[in-house]
Amino acid sequence: GSGIFQLRLQEFVNQRGMLANGQSCEPGCRTFFRICLKHFQATFSEGPCTFGNVSTPVLGTNSFVVRDKNSGSGRNPLQLPFNFTWPGTFSLNIQAWHTPGDDLRPETSPGNSLISQIIIQGSLAVGKIWRTDEQNDTLTRLSYSYRVICSDNYYGESCSRLCKKRDDHFGHYECQPDGSLSCLPGWTGKYCDQPICLSGCHEQNGYCSKPDECICRPGWQGRLCNECIPHNGCRHGTCSIPWQCACDEGWGGLFCDQDLNYCTHHSPCKNGSTCSNSGPKGYTCTCLPGYTGEHCELGLSKCASNPCRNGGSCKDQENSYHCLCPPGYYGQHCEHSTLTCADSPCFNGGSCRERNQGSSYACECPPNFTGSNCEKKVDRCTSNPCANGGQCQNRGPSRTCRCRPGFTGTHCELHISDCARSPCAHGGTCHDLENGPVCTCPAGFSGRRCEVRITHDACASGPCFNGATCYTGLSPNNFVCNCPYGFVGSRCEFPVGLPPSFPWVA
């Protein structure tokens, strides 16, 4: 504790200018005071001034009024500081002395003489109100008042309660008259060191380090930290718990990055072709006659079907074609010959057979040659017989189509649907996508093939400790423990002081 006993001297009267021994002062009693403050004694005795002592300079001669003075020599009220708990009781001895010597330091002068003394014993509570008193004896009268107040930063009825107002990391408060803390606006707690967060800030998902703030814990966002953040890899999805990826309509896959409506979103098929949401790229274009290419972007040449026979060359025209025939041939497709076997029309060892009584002929070609005159080496791949990007390969007299993944058939014309095997359990909807089938599961099921019944999820075993809330996460094997204040760990198994709850993915 710490406080000050204050004594205000008001008036001293010694009309006859007499000393205590009956002698008179010459030329008058030049008066100073000695004050001794000590613990309560029923009978005042000499001895140390246990609570403190103080002397004044000469304040006047014989009778005088003592003015208040706040500093320097002759300060009034007199100050007797103490640094202990005020006991509520005291003994006070006030002595008036005459000095023939120095006005300012009369204590040091020889020949000082006692004029009078008073002794006060009693109780005194700490407070701002002055207690006024007057003491008389046969020769003198003294008017005075006194009180006990606490030093700065000390409070309470015995000045034992220390309170220093502060506004820093350790607290934000002012001091009440009784020494209790009064928190500054926006702060709370025993030491006013806990900020009051933004009104409505989510109790578990948010916290604050200063008033009217709402800082979100990992996985949460927004003004009040009541919106979750989707998974890092999520593209076209949302969440109902942190790090989830629940696909927007028309999107599939673990990270909602596979377009289930590619045809609608991108219209990739050209020239009036039909688009279907299947195939290795998420769509397939079925071309109208006369068009080809992955997106049906290529118009087929009218000559593409090789309509000109007997070595005739084909020329594209606006809506048809024209055959330029070699010598000896005529007709729209150079199908008529003016030659006979006598003209040796068969090349590459072909045998000539006369027809129509020698007016025409037919060539029988050896293996690997073809054409009306056996003029063409057989390349069974020239007609691009392999569909859907299949690779044509000549194998002697025959050819084979090497199909891309997802296609089959002699000409790779058949699309193998991953969904044909009905891989989705429990009524899941199957979508053929580039990396295999994707299942959209009905409510209550999850997993790549909708094979997991959510009611028997990872939370069923109660993996979270200490009253934590359990959520299922991105896959059936994942769960999230949202820890209560004071616990951390993937299962909220570790007690800890700070920081409070974080969601953990196990």
């Epitope: 800082i215 990992p218 966002q221 927004g222 003004r223 919106e227 953040i229 890092n232 076209h236």
Partner: antibody, heavy 118, light 107 residues
Amino acid sequence: EVQLVESGGGLVQPGGSLRLSCAASGFTFGNFPMSWVRQAPGKGLEWVASISSSDSWATIGDSVKGRFTISRDNAKNSLYLQMNSLRAEDTAVYYCARGYYNSPFAFWGQGTLVTVSS
Amino acid sequence: DIQMTQSPSSLSASVGDRVTITCRASQEIYRNLAWYQQKPGKSPKLLIFDTSVLADGVPSRFSGSGSGTDSTLTISSLQPEDFATYYCQQYTYYPPTFGQGTKLEIK
């Protein structure tokens, strides 16, 4: 494919203003919180600001608070950073990133250079 | 603010080497740590989040581990394309803070 493309950087005098933009594609922009992160020449990375997805709640770093504001337009798939009262120490490459102040920054733009000099 | 201290600041290694980079937080960050790779003139790329989860498309030679205040990024067998600067980042406490970076150079 997720793409973030920043624009609006350039040379500006101290005390001047600049507005950076970030065009997003390849994901549903309105579903995700977004941030700005900067990198002074030859230095490390510093988080600048974040904005939530649906209520567009802005959180600004102390070093730029009162001078910079972050905003978004979900209809335009765009993120913005309004920079006022620019100082020499704001000189940096500013990156637009998908993520919040309490999450990893999963995707980043190529960056736009802001130079504050007289 | 939480201080993130990476060590070493720079590192020379050869193709095929096993490399370890450490990141220390000034207080416990509860596994909320990410690692990024940045090549000169390019933007950072997320490698690892939640201390040990590999980001989409990141080769399996990268791995992360740690608990409490200390975290580690390991590259099991260095490839030519791995020479870059690596940053760690904590996202437990506001504001998020990054390490000063570790420059991985060819020996």
